[in-house]
Amino acid sequence: AESCTSRPHITVVEGEPFYLKHCSCSLAHEIETTTKSWYKSSGSQEHVELNPRSSSRIALHDCVLEFWPVELNDTGSYFFQMKNYTQKWKLNVIRRNKHSCFTERQVTSKIVEVKKFFQITCENSYYQTLVNSTSLYKNCKKLLLENNKNPTIKKNAEFEDQGYYSCVHFLHHNGKLFNITKTFNITIVEDRSNIVPVLLGPKLNHVAVELGKNVRLNCSALLNEEDVIYWMFGEENGSDPNIHEEKEMRIMTPEGKWHASKVLRIENIGESNLNVLYNCTVASTGGTDTKSFILVRKADMADIPGHVFTR
């Protein structure tokens, strides 16, 4: 069942079918004998009870006040009363834009990130049984889609998808043809969620070591979930059995990004491990960052300025 009209302020476009559904509908069914009344007041006008005789455009059902269609002079305050329950709405009926297939003031804006899932489904559950056909327009040009009952777009967003999409439902009521238009302003934006990954700390690190000892080189990065971090060293990486990559550790940041750490452990340091570049790289679709470590014998430390050392 269609949910009730809970919004107290409603704007609609002239010439379209429209309904108000009160929010004690299930209760009203239980108390069939209870008197239920709909009222309208506009400006200084007193409450006027509504009934089908008030206007040929108005229809009253158990829970619903229908307009076939709503017109500019329907602007005003509406009340539903049943026993000690009252619900009030303020209705503003605006002019239709005669030069467009939609009215700008009745547009729902949506922002979709490029490459993310983008969907438009033309549905109208309340009038579903009365709808003959539905068309979907982009910038007021009809899109040729297979389903003419519930036209749908489902795809990964591209920048060309940006525009105004209007679902137009055509329906008959009492021998007259009506249409209901729902328009979405779709803006396609760059992927806001991804950062360019960055490695933390200096780009070049000289590490003072002693032969025969062990060292742990820690590579830390701020990255996206799908990014990778890896170590590379020498032309034929991995030929040294004393070099081990530890399991990558990740912690999510409060911003929803990831802090990753990957340690390269070099055991029983030998001459072959000195003055070699051990490169740590973080990579994403948006770019890469690399930092390098060079192992230097402690005895040779005096040859290198102090500020380039990692101890």
């Epitope: 990778v228 790289t281 990579a283 994403s284 679709t285 890469t288």
Partner: nanobody, 115 residues
Framework: EVQLVESGGGLVQPGGSLRLSCAAS????????MGWYRRAPGNQRELVAW???????GNKNSVKGRFTCSRDNAKNTVYLQMNSLKPEDTAVYYC?????????WGQGTQVTVSS
């Protein structure tokens, strides 16, 4: 936009072999160093083997002497020959760029080593 499609995975007994393929559509591998990454349950993706744009290969200690990368630039395809497979090689395998910005990840191909 480049789309990567990995294939060739499957269930294999310890000591067995598999050859994985990775094809690119909508772009080219040419001039790029390419690598094979794997992701075991509970782990992040790790680089295991690679081949540079000029054909120099490399791999990690854990797969040393067992895994080898090759490439066919004309077919825009990269391969991973996996020999002497071990249960710890069980993972989803992905190909992607090494030493540069990566392409969006493909679906990967599942390799399961079990008796």
């Amino acid at each position: 936009e480049v789309q990567l499609v990995e294939s060739g995975g499957g269930l294999v007994q310890p000591g067995g072999s598999l050859r994985l393929s990775c094809a690119a559509s909508g772009g080219s591998f040419s001039g790029k160093d390419m690598g094979w990454y794997r992701r075991a349950p509970g782990n992040q993706r790790e680089l295991v083997a690679w081949i540079t744009s000029i054909g120099i290969t490399g791999n990690k200690n854990s797969v040393k002497g067992r895994f080898t990368c090759s490439r066919d630039n004309a077919k825009n395809t990269v391969y991973l020959q996996m020999n002497s497979l071990k249960p710890e090689d069980t993972a989803v395998y992905y190909c992607n760029v090494v030493n540069g910005p990566i392409f969006p990840w493909g679906q990967g191909t599942q390799v399961t080593v079990s008796s």
